[in-house]
Interface confidence: low
């Protein structure tokens, strides 16, 4: 997160860290807890690494440096990547993770509400992006979970800024014209949440952007409302019944 500040314990209890055990272990992406056994993240986090046992999912944490070999983590039972996602493109950048074991909800570990299907009418004015990603383009993963308040921009405005890419109605953009505040590398897959009528909703999944926090280069997020049918279909067919946190 560029231009952000430290988060507090329990402020974003749905935020998870997706870590990969390579020769060493490292944080790779964020994600959002949406049910006892479900995490929503970006499909591109699994490009080339879809093997379940490589991944460790840490929930209910604030500081990555607090993680030790004894820190409990969740393992993956199933990775469900959107069927139309292609490695070479930015479209349909959404994936579901089914955890091997359900998580208990606590003050520091609980789900984010999902938007209503095809939610286009709500005007969100209080939106935040969170993650442990870089604090500048040539930066490094941050220890303490960062947060930043960023306004949504219209898709029309966003398309003007990304002439070489197609900004679809299944994407949502956020950023300041002057730049300075944005998601960055390592924040991918994490949440763009907006507070509306006193309730936080998962509006976007951090997906891509040209650099980080550049002037007139907003961040691009997967628009969760456009994928509600897919989310419900996949979680219900796997569970028998939905266990999502939905405002409706």
């Amino acid at each position: 997160i560029v231009g952000g500040t430290n988060s507090s314990w329990g402020e974003w209890p749905w935020q998870v860290s997706l870590q990969v055990k390579l020769t060493a272990q490292r944080h790779l992406c964020g994600g959002s807890l949406i049910g006892h056994q479900w995490v929503l993240t970006a499909a591109h986090c699994f490009d080339g690494l879809p093997l379940q046992d490589v991944w460790r999912i840490y929930s209910g944490i604030l500081n990555l440096s607090d993680i030790t070999k004894d820190t409990p983590f969740s393992q993956i039972k199933e990775i469900i990547i959107h069927q139309n996602y292609k490695v070479s493109e930015g479209n349909h950048d959404i994936a579901l993770i089914k955890l091997q074991a359900p998580l208990n909800y606590t003050e520091f570990q609980k789900p984010i509400c999902l938007p209503s299907k095809g939610d286009t009418s709500t005007i969100y004015t209080n939106c935040w992006v969170t993650g442990w990603g870089f604090s500048k383009e040539k930066g490094e993963i941050q220890n303490i979970l960062q947060k930043v308040n960023i306004p949504l921009v219209t898709n029309e405005e966003c398309q003007k800024r990304y002439q070489d890419y197609k900004i679809t109605q299944r994407m949502v953009c956020a950023g300041y014209k002057e730049g300075g505040k944005d998601a960055c590398k390592g924040d991918s897959g994490g949440p763009l949440v907006c507070k509306h009528n006193g309730m936080w909703r998962l509006v976007g999944i951090t997906s891509w952007g040209e650099g980080c926090a550049r002037r007139e280069q907003p961040g691009v997020y997967t628009k969760v409302a456009e994928y509600m049918d897919w989310i419900l279909e996949k979680t219900q067919s796997s569970d028998g019944k939905a266990q999502m946190q939905s405002p409706a």
């Epitope: 490009d47 080339g48 093997l51 490589v54 070479s88 998601a183 590398k185 040209e210 650099g211």
Partner: antibody, heavy 122, light 106 residues
Framework: EVQLLESGGGLVQPGGSLRLSCAAS????????MMWVRQAPGKGLEWVSG????????VYADSVKGRFTISRDNSKNTLYLQMNSLRAEDTAVYYC???????????????WGQGTMVTVSS | DIQMTQSPSTLSASVGDRVTITCRAS??????LAWYQQKPGKAPKLLIY???TLESGVPSRFSGSGSGTEFTLTISSLQPDDFATYYC????????FGQGTKVEIK
């Protein structure tokens, strides 16, 4: 854990042959371009050969063209380098390597094996 | 074939020094350049790709710049762990490495 593990190196006489293998684990081997890179004792890195994901496209450095053949078996997650007509100057540590580089703001990975030594000497 | 020329071949420096290594391509490679660090007996480690993008987990004292044919790797404040050999590598057309720059203790 993501790993590349080379094998098949050893001592061979000039004009002889060797087949190197590189067993991959922990990532979707079939999606990615794989490479062989070598390093002669006390020298720099030299790219040897590459093979695209399907195996249909192979490329070679001029120094090995016509003598070395790269191949892959995606069902076994294994990369191969068949080395014929070996010369003293082919003596080196041979590494297999893979890189994934994402689109804007996405992560990259770079994975190399530990290398296998090939010595060409009479 | 694209040739990569690195300079200097050897560089003597002290802890805390700012170190710059340059790499020149024989033809334009856009930003398709990577920098590696290698220590004796070890496989190379990726530091920077796409000319200026820092690989995850690499300290921010490393930075890369340039495009086209001229590229630079800078270590802003040399640390004891940074004494090693550094290679540039183009991947515009297959792979080609520079001949390497050994950074040694002055």
């Amino acid at each position: 854990e993501v790993q590349l593990l080379e094998s098949g190196g050893g001592l061979v006489q000039p004009g002889g042959s060797l087949r190197l293998s590189c067993a991959a684990s922990g990532f979707t081997f079939s999606h990615y371009i794989m490479m062989w890179v070598r390093q002669a004792p006390g020298k720099g890195l030299e790219w040897v050969s590459g093979i695209y994901s399907s195996g249909g496209i192979t490329v070679y450095a001029d120094s090995v063209k016509g003598r070395f053949t790269i191949s892959r078996d995606n069902s076994k997650n294994t990369l191969y380098l068949q080395m014929n007509s070996l010369r003293a100057e082919d003596t080196a540590v041979y590494y297999c390597a893979w890189r994934r580089i994402g689109v804007p703001r996405r992560d990259s990975f770079d994975m190399w094996g530990q290398g296998t030594m090939v010595t060409v000497s009479s | 074939d694209i040739q990569m020329t690195q300079s200097p071949s050897t560089l003597s420096a002290s802890v805390g020094d700012r170190v710059t290594i340059t790499c020149r391509a024989s033809q334009s490679i856009s930003s398709w350049l990577a920098w590696y660090q290698q220590k004796p007996g070890k496989a190379p480690k990726l530091l920077i790709y796409k000319a200026s993008t820092l690989e995850s987990g690499v300290p921010s004292r490393f930075s890369g710049s340039g495009s086209g044919t001229e590229f630079t790797l800078t270590i802003s404040s040399l640390q004891p762990d940074d004494f090693a050999t550094y290679y540039c590598q183009q991947y515009n057309t297959y792979w080609t490495f520079g001949q390497g720059t050994k950074v040694e203790i002055k």
